[in-house]
C-alpha cells in the first residue's frame, strides 16, 4: 500500500478573519476628500473633507481644527466669509470636489460644489508636529468672473480632478471636470484647463488655456475623470468615456490624457486608449481572442516599481508604472471571469506610444484617412491637418494641436483573474525593499495588501483584513503619511501601516518567517507577531518542525514499521535531503531510523498546497511496552534555509504498539496446484506497514487485510506434503506453530 500525506491547502497557513484594529477617525459624515501633508520639520497633517466641513487631523488622527465650509449663505460658513459680504451665489450645501496641496507655499486648496465651484486657499501653520490652517483666502475676484468667462470657477458638481504643478515662480492647476449642459451653462467650467494661481491669491489668472466638450455633444458625451497625477515632464488624466461620439454612449472605454507639465499649453494635449484584459491561461470555448476586455477603469495609481516586478515588466527598477483596476462595465459585475482586474502600464512605454502616434499623424507619408480624433473637443479633421481645416497652412504645425493616438495600449491582468469575486474600489502601490505591493480597498470594506507579481497562480498576501464592522466600500482616494496609508470608508478614515497591520494572520511558524522582511514578523512560541507584541520569546531565525499526522497509527511490538510522518518544516529544501544526524524520531522509547527519500516518489507540490513527508524505520526496543505512546521528531544542527533554520521538537500522540496474535487458520489443506483461499484469524493482524503469510517459505498472496482477519491465496506446492505456515508482521514472526497440507489436485 502506498500511503501519502494529505495535502494541506496553502490557505490553512493564514487566517484572514483575524481582527486588526487600526487607528481611525470618525468624520461625522461621508468622507468626500482627503489629503495628507508632511513638512520638512517633522510636522504633518491629514485633511478630511465632508459635506460643509473640513477637518484638520494630527499624525495620530486626533482632531486639531475644524472649519465650516458651508452651507453657502449660512452665517456660520467660515470659508464663505473670506469672500467678503455676500450674497455670492445661491445658498446650498458645499460638497468638497477638490482638496489638493500647493506644496510650493505650502497651502491647502479646497474647492466645493457651491459658490460657482470657487476655491479657497488655506496657508499651513506648523505648530509642533501638527499643522493648523490659517484664515482662508477666497480665490475669487467678483469683478473678474462672468457666467461666460470665469477663471475662478474651478470645481464641477459632477466631479473635478486637480494636479498642482510648480512652474517657475508660480503654481499651475491642471484641472479636469465632468460637465453636462446644465453645469456648462452655469459659470462655464471647462473640461480640461491649466490655470495659474495668482501670486496674491486673489484667484486664477484670466485667459487660461482650456478644452471643453462642444455644446452639441454635452448631452450625450460625458467624461468621468478618475485620476490625475504628475510625473516627469507631464501631467496625466485618466478618463472613462464613451468609445465614440456617434455610437452608443453606454459603450465605454478608458483613456489616458497627457499634458505638458513644463509649458502651460494645450497644443500638445494627447489621448491614448488604455486596454486592459483578462486572458486566462486556458481559454474557454467561445471566449474572445486576446482575452476578455475590461474597458472601465475604476481606480488608478502610479508608482515606481521594485526589482522583481520591473524584471517581469521588462523595465528598469524604480521606473514609474501606472496601475489601474478595471471592471467590465459601470455596474462592475461581469458574467464570467473576475470582478476586478489589475493592469500595469509603464509610463515610458505610454510616452513612447504617444510620441509614435504623433509621428504617424504628422510625419509624411501620413496614412490616408487617419483622423486627428477628439471630435468632442474640436472640429473633425484628418492628419496632418489642424482641427476643422482642410490643409496645413505654412505657419501652423501639425504637432501643435490636440490628438488622439490611433493605436491603443493593451495589457493583461497582472493577477491572472485571481482577484475573483473581489470588487476593488481603492488602490495605492508602494515599493518595499525589492517588492511592489498593491494596497487595495474593496467594496465590502476590506483591505488587501498583495505583492504585485504576474508569474504566479496564487496571490501573495501581506494582509487581508476588514477595516471595521460597517462593511461600507473603501473610497477611491488613498493618501500616504509616512509609513501609513489613509483609507476612507463611510464616515471613517483609517490609518493602515504600509508594512501591513500585523502578523497574527500567519498561523504557522514557517509562513510567519517566510513573510517579507519589511513586515517585521517573528515567532512567539505559538503565534506570529511583531516584536512589540511579545518581546520575551520573539525570534526570527528558526522554526520547530511541525507534525500534523503520521501513518500507520499502530505497529508491532516485535518487527519493524515503516513510519511516514507528515507536517512542515522538516527540510526547508525541495529535494527533502536530510544531512546525517539532524533528524531524530522516537516512538515511545524506540528510535525510528531515517530512510533516504525515494527519488522516484518525489513529485512537484503546487505552492497553493504544501506538505512535507519524512519516512523512518521503527524497530521497537526490547524494553518497549505495548500500548499507546507519542511520536516525537527532533531536528537539530540543520543548515539554515533561505528564511530560517529548522530547530526543535514536535510531538504527536496516537501511536500504539501492539502484539499481533494468530488464533486460527483454515482450511489446513488444499490442492498442490495452489490457489486455496486461506483465512487467518487473530488480533492486531493489520498493525504496521508490512505483513506476509509464508507457506513453506513462499508468500501466500494477500487478498484482504483487516485487524482480525487476513485472506490469502496459497502458492503451488512442490510435492504432496505437510509444510510449515507462518505469519510475519514487520518482518518478525507471530508466535504459533501451524502447518498446511498440500494434497493431490
Amino acid at each position: 500500500e502506498d500511503w501519502q500525506c494529505p495535502r494541506t491547502p496553502y490557505a490553512a497557513s493564514r487566517d484572514f478573519d483575524v481582527k486588526y484594529v487600526v487607528p481611525s477617525f470618525s468624520a461625522g459624515g461621508l468622507v468626500q476628500a482627503m489629503v495628507t501633508y508632511e513638512g520638512d520639520r517633522n510636522e504633518s497633517a491629514v485633511f478630511v473633507a465632508i459635506r460643509n466641513r473640513l477637518h484638520v487631523l494630527g499624525p495620530d488622527l486626533k482632531s486639531v481644527q475644524s472649519l465650516a465650509t458651508g452651507p453657502a449663505g449660512d452665517p456660520g460658513c467660515q470659508t464663505c466669509a473670506a469672500c467678503g459680504p455676500g450674497p455670492h451665489g445661491p445658498p446650498g450645501d458645499t460638497d468638497t470636489k477638490v482638496l489638493v496641496l500647493d506644496p510650493a507655499l505650502p497651502a491647502l486648496v479646497s474647492c466645493g460644489s457651491s459658490l460657482q465651484g470657487r476655491c479657497f486657499l488655506h496657508d499651513l501653520e506648523p505648530q509642533g508636529t501638527a499643522v493648523h490652517l490659517a484664515a482662508p483666502a477666497c480665490l475669487f475676484s467678483a469683478h473678474h468672473n462672468r457666467p461666460d468667462d470665469c477663471p475662478d470657477c474651478v470645481a464641477s458638481p459632477l466631479g473635478t480632478r486637480v494636479t498642482v504643478v510648480e512652474q517657475g515662480q508660480a503654481s499651475y492647476f491642471y484641472v479636469a471636470s465632468s460637465l453636462d449642459a446644465a453645469v456648462a451653462a452655469s459659470f462655464s467650467p471647462r473640461s480640461v484647463s491649466i490655470r495659474r494661481l495668482k501670486a496674491d491669491a486673489s484667484g486664477f489668472a484670466p485667459g487660461f488655456v482650456a478644452l471643453s466638450v462642444l455644446p452639441k455633444h454635452l448631452v450625450s458625451y460625458s467624461i468621468e475623470y478618475v485620476h490625475s497625477f504628475h510625473t516627469g515632464a507631464f501631467v496625466y488624466f485618466l478618463t472613462v468615456q464613451p468609445a465614440s461620439v456617434t455610437d452608443d454612449p453606454s459603450a465605454l472605454h478608458t483613456r489616458l490624457a497627457r499634458l505638458s507639465a513644463t509649458e502651460p499649453e494645450l497644443g500638445d494635449y494627447r489621448e491614448l486608449v488604455l486596454d486592459c484584459r483578462f486572458a486566462p491561461k486556458r481559454r474557454r470555448r467561445g471566449a474572445p481572442e486576446g482575452g476578455q476586455p475590461y474597458p472601465v477603469l475604476r481606480v488608478a495609481h502610479s508608482a515606481p516599481v521594485g526589482a522583481q516586478l520591473a524584471t517581469e515588466l521588462s523595465i528598469a527598477e524604480g521606473q514609474e508604472v501606472l496601475f489601474g483596476v478595471f471592471v467590465t462595465g459601470k455596474d462592475g459585475g461581469p458574467g464570467v471571469g473576475p470582478n476586478s482586474v489589475v493592469c500595469a502600464f509603464p509610463i515610458d512605454l505610454l510616452d513612447t506610444l504617444i510620441d509614435e502616434g504623433v509621428e504617424r499623424c504628422c510625419e509624411s507619408p501620413v496614412h490616408p484617412g487617419l483622423r486627428r480624433g477628439l471630435d468632442f473637443f474640436q472640429s473633425p479633421s484628418f492628419c496632418p491637418n489642424p482641427p476643422g481645416l482642410e490643409a496645413l497652412s505654412p505657419n501652423t504645425s501639425c504637432r501643435h494641436f490636440p490628438l488622439l493616438v490611433s493605436s491603443s495600449f493593451s495589457r493583461v491582468d497582472l493577477f491572472n483573474g485571481l482577484l475573483g469575486p473581489v470588487q476593488v474600489t481603492a488602490l495605492y502601490v508602494t515599493r518595499l525593499d525589492n517588492v511592489t505591493v498593491a494596497h487595495m480597498g474593496t467594496m465590502d470594506g476590506r483591505i488587501l495588501q498583495v505583492e504585485l507579481v504576474r508569474s504566479l497562480n496564487y496571490l501573495l498576501y501581506v494582509s487581508n483584513f476588514s477595516l471595521g464592522d460597517s462593511g461600507q466600500p473603501v473610497q477611491r482616494d488613498v493618501s500616504r503619511l509616512g509609513d501609513h496609508l489613509l483609507f476612507a470608508s463611510g464616515d471613517q478614515v483609517f490609518q493602515v501601516p504600509i508594512q501591513g497591520p500585523g502578523c497574527r494572520h500567519f498561523l504557522t511558524c514557517g509562513r510567519c518567517l517566510r513573510a517579507w522582511h519589511f513586515m517585521g514578523c517573528g515567532w512567539c512560541g505559538n503565534m506570529c507577531g511583531q516584536q512589540k507584541e511579545c518581546p520575551g520569546s520573539w525570534q526570527q531565525d528558526h522554526c520547530p518542525p511541525k507534525l500534523t499526522e503520521f501513518h500507520p497509527h499502530s505497529g508491532p511490538l516485535r518487527g519493524s514499521t515503516r513510519l511516514t510522518l507528515c507536517g512542515s518544516n522538516f527540510y526547508l529544501h525541495p529535494s527533502g535531503l536530510v544531512p546525517e544526524g539532524t533528524h531524530q524520531v522516537t516512538v515511545g522509547q524506540s528510535p525510528c531510523r531515517p530512510l533516504p527519500k525515494d527519488s522516484s516518489k518525489l513529485r512537484p507540490v503546487p505552492r497553493k498546497d504544501f506538505v512535507e513527508e519524512f519516512e523512518c524505520e521503527l524497530e521497537p526496543l526490547g524494553t518497549q511496552a505495548v500500548g499507546p505512546t507519542n511520536v516525537s521528531l527532533t531536528v537539530t544542527n540543520m543548515p539554515p534555509g533561505k528564511h530560517f533554520r529548522v530547530d526543535g521538537t514536535s510531538v504527536l500522540r496516537g501511536f500504539s504498539f501492539m502484539e499481533p496474535v494468530l488464533i486460527a487458520v483454515q482450511p489446513l489443506f488444499g490442492p498442490r496446484a495452489g490457489g486455496t483461499c486461506l483465512t487467518l484469524e487473530g488480533q492486531s493482524l493489520s498493525v504496521g506497514t508490512s505483513r506476509a503469510v509464508l507457506v513453506n517459505g513462499t508468500e501466500c498472496l494477500l487478498a484482504r487485510v483487516s485487524e482480525g482477519q487476513l485472506l490469502c491465496a496459497t502458492p503451488p506446492g512442490a510435492t504432496v506434503a505437510s509444510v510449515p505456515l507462518s505469519l510475519q508482521v514487520g518482518g518478525a514472526q507471530v508466535p504459533g506453530s501451524w502447518t498446511f497440507q498440500y494434497r493431490e489436485d
Epitope: A137, H144, Q169, K198, A199, A205, P206
Partner: antibody
Framework: EVQLQQSGPELEKPGASVKISCKAS????????MNWVKQSNGESLEWIGD????????RYNQKFKGKATLTVDKSSSTAYMQLKSLTSEDSAVYYC?????????WGQGTLVTVSA | DIQMTQSPASLSASVGETVTITCRAS??????LAWYQKKQGKSPQLLVY???TSVEGVPSRFSGSGSGIQFSLKINSLQPEDFGSYYC???????????FGGGTKLEIK
C-alpha cells in the same frame, strides 16, 4: 524668453509729470500683473503698486497714491507708470517687475532725475 | 502694513566665509518671503522665494529658511561675485501688499 524692456532715462523739472514704459515680451502679457518698484540712491526698494493688464485693476502702496498712475496698452503689451507733481524726492531708478512668488523678471530700470 | 526688519544693515566678510542675513516680519507672513541680490547699476536678482525655494540657476550656496515671522538667508563659502546688497521681500499674498526689508550691504573684508 521673458523680457521687460523699459524706456530710457528722464530728466524732469520739479512740478512736471513723467510717463515711463515697460514693454513685455516672451509671455502672455495679460496673464500676469505688472509691479513697479522704486529705488532711491542708496536706499532700499519700495513697492509702488501693480496693475492687472487683463482687467485694468490697480493697487497702490498708500505712500504712492496720488503720485503714481499705472496703465497698460494691451495691444502693444506695454505697461506705463506716470509720476506727477515731481519733486527731488522722486529722483530714483524705477523698475517694472512681473508678478510671481517673488519677482523673477525685472526691467533694466529707468532713471528719473528731478532737477531745477 | 507689514514691516520687514532686516539685519545686519551692513556686513563685511572674506571670500570662503559663511554668512547669514536675517529678516523679521511684523506679523505672520507664513512662507511668503523672497530674497534678492542687488548690484550697483543692475536689476535685482531673485535668489529664493517661498522662504526656502531656490530659483533655478542660482548657485546652491544660497539657501533660505524660516517661516512665520523669522527668516534667514545663508551664503556658504562666499565668492567674489556675491558682494553687493541683499533684500528680503514680503511677497504679495492674500490681503497683503509687497514690502521690502531695509537691505543688507555685504562688503569684501
Amino acid at each position: 524668453e521673458v523680457q521687460l524692456q523699459q524706456s530710457g532715462p528722464e530728466l524732469e523739472k520739479p512740478g512736471a509729470s513723467v510717463k515711463i514704459s515697460c514693454k513685455a515680451s516672451g509671455y502672455s502679457f495679460t496673464g500676469y500683473n505688472m509691479n513697479w518698484v522704486k529705488q532711491s540712491n542708496g536706499e532700499s526698494l519700495e513697492w509702488i503698486g501693480d496693475i492687472d493688464p487683463y482687467y485694468g485693476g490697480t493697487r497702490y502702496n498708500q505712500k504712492f497714491k496720488g503720485k503714481a498712475t499705472l496703465t497698460v496698452d494691451k495691444s502693444s503689451s506695454t505697461a506705463y507708470m506716470q509720476l506727477k507733481s515731481l519733486t527731488s524726492e522722486d529722483s530714483a531708478v524705477y523698475y517694472c517687475a512681473r508678478e510671481g512668488r517673488g519677482f523673477a523678471y525685472w526691467g533694466q530700470g529707468t532713471l528719473v532725475t528731478v532737477s531745477a | 502694513d507689514i514691516q520687514m526688519t532686516q539685519s545686519p544693515a551692513s556686513l563685511s566678510a572674506s571670500v570662503g566665509e559663511t554668512v547669514t542675513i536675517t529678516c523679521r516680519a511684523s506679523e505672520n507672513i507664513y512662507s511668503y518671503l523672497a530674497w534678492y541680490q542687488k548690484k550697483q547699476g543692475k536689476s535685482p536678482q531673485l535668489l529664493v522665494y517661498n522662504a526656502k525655494t531656490s530659483v533655478e540657476g542660482v548657485p546652491s550656496r544660497f539657501s533660505g529658511s524660516g517661516s512665520g515671522i523669522q527668516f534667514s538667508l545663508k551664503i556658504n563659502s562666499l565668492q567674489p561675485e556675491d558682494f553687493g546688497s541683499y533684500y528680503c521681500h514680503c511677497q504679495h499674498h492674500y490681503g497683503t501688499l509687497p514690502t521690502f526689508g531695509g537691505g543688507t550691504k555685504l562688503e569684501i573684508k
